[in-house]
């Protein structure tokens, strides 16, 4: 379980890397509570006839995707970025958008967003991950360093139809998906419901009625009894794994 790994962090997420490393005193390791088991994601998406959809930022991708280079690491080849399948629970991440809906990037690991831990108005202990140089430390060495900041966080979850930015803004059972030119909370798809599997992503970024992803334990697959002449128009539904 994830209890077997101790996590340290010392970076404010989405900040550029430090120049010459960070300094500070070694931070204490934080044990992370175990989460629910999940399906692992692959290095590349493996849809039939999959054509990568180029992107510049996460918002151009689907709610269960993020924008990054498909090559190893984050460097990329020639700076080309495409929409990649989101990272499941307990996978390595570098920012929140990499994690699948219902998860967030905590100390480099996609963790479930268990909002029961944060009731409305509760004081939350937030870790500020510090990259500042500390001249008392060994010069140039980077050490995990943590500073605690107390802040008041209000967690109000968007109901169906509420405007949202990402799925974590929506209540349980909802995801944040495009509707016309904004994004609203829509229901996560149930077994048997029609889903969208993008074989050609050319119009994906301009999809104005975006469906949610399939719910837990379901995958978007071609409906077995749905045979049509055109491959591109075959119906996909949410089916049990």
């Amino acid at each position: 379980t994830l209890n077997s790994v101790l996590i340290n962090s010392n970076a404010i997420k989405n900040l550029p890397p430090p120049l010459g490393g960070a300094g500070g005193q070694p931070g204490s390791a934080v044990s992370v509570a175990p989460g629910v088991l999940y399906e692992g994601g692959n290095k590349y998406q493996t849809l039939d006839n999959y054509q990568p959809y180029p992107c510049a930022e996460d918002e151009e991708c689907g709610s269960d995707e993020y924008c990054s280079s498909p090559s190893r690491g984050a460097a990329g080849v020639g700076g080309v970025q495409i929409c990649l399948a989101c990272r499941k629970r307990r996978k390595r991440c570098m920012r929140h958008a990499m994690c699948c809906p219902g998860n967030y990037c905590k100390n480099g690991i996609c963790m479930p967003s268990d909002h029961s831990h944060f009731p409305r108005g509760e004081i939350e202990e937030s870790i500020i991950e510090n990259l500042g140089n500390d001249h008392n430390a060994a010069a140039g060495d980077g050490y995990p360093r943590r500073t605690t900041l107390t802040s008041k966080i209000y967690h109000t979850k968007g109901q169906e139809g509420s405007v949202c930015l990402r799925s974590s803004d929506c209540a349980a059972g909802l995801c944040c998906a495009r509707h016309f030119w904004s994004k609203i909370c829509k229901p996560v798809l149930k077994e048997g419901q029609v889903c969208t599997k993008h074989k050609r992503k050319g119009s994906h970024g301009l999809e104005i009625f975006q469906r949610c992803y399939c719910g837990e334990g379901l995958a978007c697959r071609i409906q077995k009894d749905h045979h049509q002449a055109s491959n591109s128009s075959r119906l996909h539904t949410c089916q049990r794994h």
Epitope: P17, K43, L84, R90, N107, G108, P144
Partner: antibody
Framework: QVQLVQSGAEVKKPGASVKVSCKAS????????ISWVRQATGLGLEWMGW????????GYAQNFQGRVTMTWNTSISTVYMELSSLRSEDTAVYYC????????????WGRGTTVTVSS | DIQMTQSPSSLSASVGDRVTITCQAS??????LNWYQQKPGKAPKLLIY???NLETGVPSRFSGSGSGTDFTFTISSLQPEDIATYYC?????????FGQGTRLEIK
């Protein structure tokens, strides 16, 4: 070319600490995790943990709880693994490996640093 | 922790033989599995990632398959330079764990 160069062999007494370095070249150092894996003579591979020099994230396997510290120096593209309170069973070859954080494949390895713990 | 069990622990085969190594996970790990080759006195080398994808520059005689808990690594036609120990590694859950290794020898 893409490579990880590790520091030389070490002989330590029980209770002491050892600090192994791993210098990266030929790739963007901050775009990958660096994992540390050890291998005792004639035995299998044991993952110790990772660190990401860009974010500073580190994760340690619980077997090494409280004994391992992974640090880095971005300016010289080097990561360090320090293991304290050494015991005889820590005698092993310690490898650093470039690790993709998408599929956690360790595709570039250092040659290994032999650490011998003996009184 | 997820336990990875490889079998056999060692095997002897002739040049040109088809060689198969299996790896079993103690729980479902989807396709989150890599295979490595380690020659004596050397560092491991990544051969297969995501259970079945061949790493760049690795000869096509190496292949991998499987998902869930049961995985197979195959060398379609054994070559003298394939003498090594082979390890599977799961990355579905932390900590990362390796199989105990399979030592391959030439008959």
């Amino acid at each position: 070319q893409v490579q990880l160069v590790q520091s030389g062999a070490e002989v330590k007494k029980p209770g002491a600490s050892v600090k192994v370095s791993c210098k990266a070249s030929g790739f963007t150092f901050t775009s990958y995790d660096i994992s540390w894996v050890r291998q005792a003579t004639g035995l299998g591979l044991e993952w110790m943990g990772w660190m990401n020099p860009s974010s500073g994230y580190t994760g340690y396997a619980q077997n090494f709880q409280g004994r391992v510290t992974m640090t880095w120096n971005t300016s010289i593209s080097t990561v360090y693994m320090e293991l304290s309170s050494l015991r005889s069973e820590d005698t092993a070859v310690y490898y650093c490996a470039r690790t993709d954080y998408y599929y956690y494949g360790m595709d570039v390895w250092g040659r290994g640093t032999t650490v011998t713990v003996s009184s | 922790d997820i336990q990875m069990t490889q079998s056999p622990s060692s095997l002897s085969a002739s040049v040109g033989d088809r060689v198969t190594i299996t790896c079993q996970a103690s729980q479902d790990i989807s396709k989150d599995l890599n295979w490595y080759q380690q020659k004596p006195g050397k560092a491991p080398k990544l051969l297969i990632y995501d259970a079945s994808n061949l790493e760049t520059g690795v000869p096509s005689r190496f292949s991998g398959s499987g998902s869930g808990t049961d995985f197979t690594f195959t060398i379609s036609s054994l070559q003298p330079e394939d003498i090594a120990t082979y390890y599977c590694q799961q990355y579905d859950d932390l900590p990362i764990t390796f199989g105990q290794g399979t030592r391959l020898e030439i008959k």
